[in-house]
Interface confidence: low
Amino acid sequence: DAHKSEVAHRFKDLGEENFKALVLIAFAQYLQQCPFEDHVKLVNEVTEFAKTCVADESAENCDKSLHTLFGDKLCTVATLRETYGEMADCCAKQEPERNECFLQHKDDNPNLPRLVRPEVDVMCTAFHDNEETFLKKYLYEIARRHPYFYAPELLFFAKRYKAAFTECCQAADKAACLLPKLDELRDEGKASSAKQRLKCASLQKFGERAFKAWAVARLSQRFPKAEFAEVSKLVTDLTKVHTECCHGDLLECADDRADLAKYICENQDSISSKLKECCEKPLLEKSHCIAEVENDEMPADLPSLAADFVESKDVCKNYAEAKDVFLGMFLYEYARRHPDYSVVLLLRLAKTYETTLEKCCAAADPHECYAKVFDEFKPLVEEPQNLIKQNCELFEQLGEYKFQNALLVRYTKKVPQVSTPTLVEVSRNLGKVGSKCCKHPEAKRMPCAEDYLSVVLNQLCVLHEKTPVSDRVTKCCTESLVNRRPCFSALEVDETYVPKEFNAETFTFHADICTLSEKERQIKKQTALVELVKHKPKATKEQLKAVMDDFAAFVEKCCKADDKETCFAEEGKKLVAASQAALGL
């Protein structure tokens, strides 16, 4: 519908609280270095303007697009050039180029200090003193560190964050109540951010068709009783929502997401029997619940796929008439029958089917040519199955920390040019696949594992894109979205890599390691392991294990010593010498 004033339309649809929160998220995701107070000021100005438009849609500037209004507001920031450098050049452009320019300057790894959690009493005091500012600060800090965070979902996180403080700041043991809740929100938030980052990368790097294919497969697994036309409608609407959010159109995105949740709940009889509980919840919880809902049961007596997609004489005719619709139907039919497959595997099968039809429908005898197409699927299915089986066995044998270390060594040898912090972060996340997925029965392992790995490898791809250092990473990241994981799996040791010069400073540790949390201490040790492999890429597992065991013993010994700093200095030198000898450095 055409509205005289887009800003008034969205303000009325979303309400003042959500409007202000979403504008704050949008601004913080664009100008990631700006102080909180500056953003609050900008948001208040936009909100006051929106209210004038609600009162009179014909008022001056109320007919301007949201991009124009928000872009003009962002471009009033006085320190734009000093803080953001060339991003300031965006302000010389007209819409829509200006918004595209802002989008291109979003930084997946902004140079921001780590968020340090204050004492519980300090947080509770701040929460009680000014609840509104406290919650705005949460939105701001998350949004600027995660510039692609799914904005309507961040509103849901903020609601849970508020609920945690409301409950726990009154509890007898505030810390025991609050800290586990904050840990859970942090971990879920990181996972949510990474999942959304993959959706945006899919849309921005591979286009709408790639995203729609992903959505057809996933929604068909989730709603196997829904008709193809119903799934197609949901896919179109979901694509619009994510295109908007990934494009910085957060007000439209949140509004359309609410409409989609409403539609799904009004039509749940023709979509899924699992939606009842979700649809009884308030809006933010409802949308979150629908997005996470379990797969519905498969309809009984689904006919064989071969009849329509291999045996029929009309395959090429149907394909030629509407290629994407026919391939969409194939993907829908295959996915609803296979909740046990990962989405990326289903997309590989659809791609193989498409390639076969492209070739065979131009052949002298098309039917004979594509008759055995389903046989080509077997190796594609077996590859991830075998890989998951092997890695779950390794995980069960080693436990999470040592499994992460095995992956650290594996990936450092594959792509040693990648920065150490990125290798540590990505390998630690890859290693979490074990605890996350290996506990599941066979039928749930592959969708859990391979689709999770797609999310983690996308983190590697977006971090690497900022500072490309490895042609191998660029190749695996850009050639095919669905083949990223097989591409990385297939990489062998990089024989062209020139080992890093040995630097004793890299392996010098101090007493501060003793006061770190277990997680932080692991990261220190894993950082050292990556550096070791970069120095000695040909080191065997046994050599690396021996050095790491010595290192763990050294840290434990010095942390128990009376004079810790002296111990680290003296024993550290011995450890470095012993390690050099053991690895032949």
Epitope: P96, E97, E100, Q204, F206, G207, E208, E479, S480
Partner: nanobody, 115 residues
């Protein structure tokens, strides 16, 4: 209906140049990254080069780096590939695709490099 129509191919001597064009219609061209892909006789498709939606970020296969230049004109909804210092091994059907896909949705244009 998405349509991609390539042109500009032909027969050229080794060391020569060609400029390929790809006219797009049926989708919001300026919103999508685009790629050039080629397929030599009897071989699978090979990704050649890619450009992001705004034209700022370009990527090339190792085999064409320094010789080929990808560009786009969003106003004209057209993708280009300037090919210099052509070699016999560049002989192939060249086609453009949306995103980084190597799936062929168009006829392509034949490039033959031969003396």
């Amino acid at each position: 209906q998405v349509q991609l129509v390539e042109s500009g191919g032909g027969l050229v001597q080794p060391g020569g140049s060609l400029r390929l064009s790809c006219a797009a219609s049926g989708f919001t061209f300026g919103r999508f990254g685009m790629s050039w892909v080629r397929q030599a006789p009897g071989k699978g498709p090979e990704w050649v080069s890619a450009i992001d939606s705004g034209g700022a970020d370009t990527r090339y296969a190792e085999s064409v780096k320094g010789r080929f230049t990808i560009s786009r004109d969003n106003a004209k909804k057209t993708l280009y590939l300037q090919m210099n210092s052509l070699k016999p091994e560049d002989t192939a059907v060249y086609y453009c695709t949306i995103g980084r896909s190597t799936s062929r949705g168009s006829q392509g244009t034949q490039v033959t490099v031969s003396s």
